[in-house]
C-alpha cells in the first residue's frame, strides 16, 4: 500500500468494467478514498 500519487488529474474506476467505467478518464472523479465530494452522474443500477 502506498500514498496516493497524483500523476494525472483524470481517473477511471478499476472494477466497473470497460462498458460501465468512465473510459475517457474523466477528471470529475476524485482520487480514491479521499475526502472529496463525488461528482459522478446518477449511478446505473444494474440489478433489477
Amino acid at each position: 500500500m502506498e500514498d496516493f500519487n497524483m500523476e494525472s488529474d483524470s481517473f477511471e474506476d478499476f472494477w466497473k468494467g470497460e462498458d460501465l467505467s468512465n473510459y475517457s478518464y474523466s477528471s470529475t472523479l476524485p482520487p480514491f478514498l479521499l475526502d472529496a465530494a463525488p461528482c459522478e452522474p446518477e449511478s446505473l443500477e444494474i440489478n433489477k
Epitope: M1, F4, N5, E7, S8, S10, F11, E12, D13, F14, W15, K16, G17, E18, D19, L20, Y25, L29, P30, P31, F32, L33, L34, D35, A36, P38, E40, E42, S43, L44, E45, I46, N47
Partner: antibody, heavy 120, light 116 residues
Framework: QVQLVQSGAEVKKPGSSVKVSCKAS????????ISWVRQAPGQGPEWMGW????????NYAQKFQGRVTMTRDTSISTAYMELSRLRPDDTAVYYC?????????????WGQGTLVTVSS | QAVLTQPSSLSASPGASVSLTCTLR?????????IYWYQQKPGSPPQFLLR?????????GSGVPSRFSGSRDASANAGILLISGLRSEDEADYYC?????????FGGGTQLTVLG
Amino acid sequence: QVQLVQSGAEVKKPGSSVKVSCKASGGTLSSYAISWVRQAPGQGPEWMGWINPNSGGTNYAQKFQGRVTMTRDTSISTAYMELSRLRPDDTAVYYCASGYCSRTRCYDYWGQGTLVTVSS
Amino acid sequence: QAVLTQPSSLSASPGASVSLTCTLRSGINVGAYRIYWYQQKPGSPPQFLLRYKSDSDKQQGSGVPSRFSGSRDASANAGILLISGLRSEDEADYYCAIWHSSAWVFGGGTQLTVLG
C-alpha cells in the same frame, strides 16, 4: 495511507448467513466501486459483485444473485457483504478490493481477507 | 470450455524470461479485451500487476517493476504476461482476468516455480 481492513474469521453452519465488513482506514469511501472476490482453498479468485459506495448501486455476479447483498455505511466508511443460505462449498477467503486507473498506471487496494468456514 | 485457460504450472531458472499465457475461449476475441494480470503469494491477497489491450492501451500496477510486461498473441487468441530477469521472489501464482458479459472472469492460474 489508505487501507481496507476486514472483519475477522467466521465459522458458520450450513443454511445460515455471514456478513463481512470492509472499512476504509485512513480515508473515506469514494465513488470507486468496491468489489468482493472470494477464493476457495486451492482455487482461483471468483468475483461476487461490486457496490458503488457513492450511490449504493450494485452489480452482482449471476451465480450469487438472490444470495448476496452488498451494502455500505458511508458515515463509518465501511462496506458490507452478506451471503445467505451458506453451503460447505462457500468455505473461502473473502476479499474486498477497490482502485482506480490513470492513463498509464493502476492503483489497487485489497483487504487482508476474511476466512469464512461453513461446517456442520 | 472455460472462458480463460492458463497452464497449471511453469518453472524456470533465475535470470530467465518467461511467458505466461491466458487463452480466451473460441469466439471471444482477445483483441476486444483488456487482459488483467495478478500475482498472488501464499497467505496474501492477489496483487494487480498490469492490464494490456494494446500498446496504446496498457497500464502498469503501482510499484510494479517494468520487467513485468503484457502483450497478446492474436493467432493463439491469448494474452501474455512476460516476466524478464526472473527472480526468486517471482515464485507465485499468476491469474489473468477479463470483464466479460458484465462480470469479472478469472483464469485458473499458473503456479510459477523459480528453480535453484
